[in-house]
């Protein structure tokens, strides 16, 4: 991979000096580097209205290396590029700018959000739930005897949390009435939470509506639909009262 | 929208020379180093020869350092392929492309036989 | 030189089938590493760049990793129009060189 001698030659400076600093091979007063020593790189920085050569181990911030057969050299990425794999190809932008394909944007394209940790523009990510769990079994200040009326919760699980601008999770428990064939409690049974128990079919007029469990809105993000006001949620308190059967609201 | 149109391909007897040309547009052609690369029917890729952005210095592949040239013309946005003492086994498509550590932008290619 | 070994040379997958491509390089690189996508008749087209970048219209079933001497290509769902061969090159030093190809057909 021999350099073929191009048309222009590089003429030596006047004041070419071997006796030159830091890793560079051939130096000028005027230039700085004119080459580096081997496997260094060499950069042009701009120091006013003048580019001196210097030598470096890898190229700085705003610069890619190519290492050519007979020099290693820095080439400037674009202005808004911080690290770039070449010209048309960035890899980390400068602060203020995203990072989308290469490219560096004020602002990402639509249908994508900026990541403000890694910088780049990202696709949205909607919230994914799992089913439903089985309902658990019907209980009444965790006891699953001695009462006719009480309460069921069954649980999903959040899949993918979303991202900003993704869409809101939905409730992850729900709460619901039940009934269950009055029993006495046995001995030693007080408080423990069995499995075996009757459902009885709700009474005509009564309700089986599961409500959203106020616990589900702590691991998901809260719709506004779903926010109560005290008064609706007196209201609410006052028909279940005539209805004889206590619901669990949103708070 | 970036272009790059080869042409100078064609059947030539081994010995004898041939000259490709490589006409760019769509981007600034002389920020970019240029390269040659060739593809053997049926077979991989292989890198022929690069000439940096301003013209000064050219690589070449072993395979044809000594008997290929390149050259080019900012002004017209062209990259030229000078293969001299030409041998079968250089029968292949040539296609002419952006080189930046990558090959960015490459044309449709030309063929060249070497053959008698 | 760097040396590159590709694998396999050829492969035939179904349709949504996920695929892999590897490639071994002779000496640590970092992540100067190229995946190109060759269709029958056509030139070259960049896919992945710098080892795992997607180059511009690329579909996001592409993916590339790897760093140092042994990197891959994964095509998470084959599709119909994936099917090319497929070219590794490393850009860390001169002489830019090639893998020898991987044929992807469609079964």
């Known amino acids: 991979q021999n350099a073929s001698r191009g048309r222009r030659q590089r003429r030596m400076h006047p004041n070419v000096s071997q006796g030159c600093q830091g890793g560079c091979a051939t130096c000028s007063d005027y230039n700085g580097c004119l080459s580096c020593k081997p496997r260094l790189f060499f950069a042009l920085e701009r120091i006013g209205m003048k580019q001196i050569g210097v030598c470096l181990s890898s190229c700085p911030s705003g610069y890619y290396g190519t290492r050519y057969p007979d020099i290693n050299k820095c080439t400037k990425c674009k202005a808004d590029c911080d690290t770039c794999f070449n010209k048309n190809f960035c890899t980390k932008c400068k602060s203020g700018f995203y990072l989308h394909l290469g490219k560096c944007l004020d602002n990402c394209p639509e249908g994508l959000e900026a990541n403000n940790h890694t910088m780049e523009c990202v696709s949205i990510v909607h919230c994914e739930v799992s089913e439903w769990n089985p309902w658990s079994p019907c209980t009444k200040k965790g006891k699953t005897c001695g009462f006719k009326r009480g309460t069921e919760t069954r649980v999903r699980e959040i899949i993918q949390h979303p991202s900003a601008k993704g869409n809101l999770c939905p409730p992850t428990n729900e709460t619901r009435k039940c009934t269950v064939q009055r029993k006495k409690c046995q001995k030693g049974e007080r408080g423990k939470k069995g499995r075996e128990r009757k459902r009885k079919k709700p009474n005509k007029g009564e309700s089986k509506e599961a409500i959203p469990d106020s616990k589900s809105l702590e691991s998901s993000k809260e719709i506004p639909e779903q926010r109560e006001n005290k008064q609706q949620q007196k209201k609410r308190k006052v028909q279940d009262k005539q209805k004889s059967v206590s619901v669990s609201t949103v708070h | 929208e970036v272009q790059l149109v080869e042409s100078g391909g064609g059947l030539v007897q081994p010995g004898r020379s041939l000259k490709l040309s490589c006409a760019a547009s769509?981007?600034?052609?002389?920020?970019?180093?240029m390269a040659w690369v060739r593809q053997a029917p049926k077979k991989g890729l292989e890198w022929v020869a690069t000439?940096?952005?301003?013209?000064?210095?050219?690589y070449f592949g072993d395979s044809v350092r000594g008997r290929f040239t390149v050259s080019r013309d900012n002004t017209k946005s062209t990259l030229y392929l000078q293969m001299d003492s030409l041998r079968s086994e250089d029968t292949a498509t040539y296609y002419c492309?952006?080189?930046?550590?990558?090959?960015?932008?490459w044309g449709q290619g030309v063929m060249v036989t070497v053959s008698s | 030189d760097i040396q590159m070994t590709q694998s396999p040379a050829s492969l035939s997958a179904s349709l949504g089938e996920t695929v892999s491509i590897e490639c071994l390089v002779s000496?640590?690189?970092?992540?100067?590493f190229v995946w190109y996508q060759q269709k029958s008749g056509k030139s070259p087209q960049l896919l992945i760049y710098?080892?795992?970048r997607l180059q511009d219209g690329v579909p996001s079933r592409f993916s590339g990793s790897g760093s140092g001497t042994r990197f891959s290509l994964r095509i998470s769902g084959m599709q119909p129009e994936d099917e090319a061969e497929y070219f590794c090159q490393q850009s860390y030093k001169y002489p830019p060189t090639f893998g020898a190809g991987t044929k992807l057909e469609l079964k």
């Open positions: 000496e640590d690189i970092s992540n100067d």
């Open positions: 710098a080892a795992s």
């Open positions: 492309t952006a080189h930046d550590r990558s090959f960015d932008y």
């Open positions: 000439i940096i952005y301003d013209g000064s210095r050219a």
């Open positions: 769509g981007f600034t052609f002389s920020d970019y180093d």
